[in-house]
Amino acid sequence: MMTGTIETTGNISAEKGGSIILQCHLSSTTAQVTQVNWEQQDQLLAICNADLGWHISPSFKDRVAPGPGLGLTLQSLTVNDTGEYFCIYHTYPDGTYTGRIFLEVLESSVAEHGARFQIP
């Protein structure tokens, strides 16, 4: 039975040209995290495997930095980066847990963080 929950940074906004940290946290389970995949709607951004290290997709290599931790830092933001991002936690023995973050990249200098929320 999957008892864990993913806590994410929720709905966030950032300025064009700036950077943002995409972060998820798995709690309420003793399952071992073996890998975390970071995805956009239809493409992979990165994979962090506990043993094999990081994979950064070539289309993001110039502006994605691994970490902090299992998170991902997205740099040189453009308006096209606006959208949904998913953290997929591969765990043993539970299976996969998915968290969702919505990022809005703003033209203006007013960019505030949204509230944190949980996805069961």
Epitope: T34, Q35, N37, E39, D42, Q43, L44, I47, N49, A50, D51, L52, G53, W54, H55, I56, S57, P58, S59, K61, P66, H90
Partner: antibody, heavy 119, light 107 residues
Framework: QVQLVQSGAEVVKPGASVKVSCKTS????????MHWVKQAPGQRLEWIGG????????RNNQKFKGRVTITVDTSASTAYMELSSLRSEDSAVYYC????????????WGQGTLVTVSS | DIQMTQSPSSLSTSVGDRVTITCKAS??????VVWYQQKPGKAPKLLIY???YRYTGVPSRFSGSGSGTDFTFTISSVQPEDFATYYC?????????FGQGTKVEIK
Amino acid sequence: QVQLVQSGAEVVKPGASVKVSCKTSGYTFTENTMHWVKQAPGQRLEWIGGINPNQGGNRNNQKFKGRVTITVDTSASTAYMELSSLRSEDSAVYYCARSGLRDYAMDYWGQGTLVTVSS
Amino acid sequence: DIQMTQSPSSLSTSVGDRVTITCKASQHVSTAVVWYQQKPGKAPKLLIYSPSYRYTGVPSRFSGSGSGTDFTFTISSVQPEDFATYYCQQHYSTPWTFGQGTKVEIK
């Protein structure tokens, strides 16, 4: 230039073990993950597992049920794959392969080592 | 484990023809797919990764596309040196898995 040179062919008896080596050169050994891939005659390629020489962490295919041990000697820039309790279906060509820096695609491969399990 | 199924398993073609190979994953693998070429008695060679980027030195006649579960590998105009077996592989989750291969033969 990057090179991966594997040890020579082996003929081993059922129940025994075999240890295949993969000597690398032309790049910084600790920066790239090393993998082992099996190819039995007429079969698809099969990922055995990989190891991150920098931290020593390794991930193995559970199909091999603990019979495989992947290690590295960073001072010799060499990776090893040991397979125990050998049976006839382990007869295959075994390849070492390196994946790129922060990239899982296996970009350089060894020449392969033929292991024949026969009594 | 994620199963990768290629089609066709083999095909006969002539120099100059266009060849398309498909690879279907048993579950979502996003864009974590790679294509290799293997000739008899030789190690595989990386051609395409992620899944539309040509590896260094790979001719432009080779291309790849796809996302999710469906992927395509194309040789726009087959050359004599292209007769070989081609494999897709996913690295979305471990264990990494390969397709069964597609043998491209001379007609």
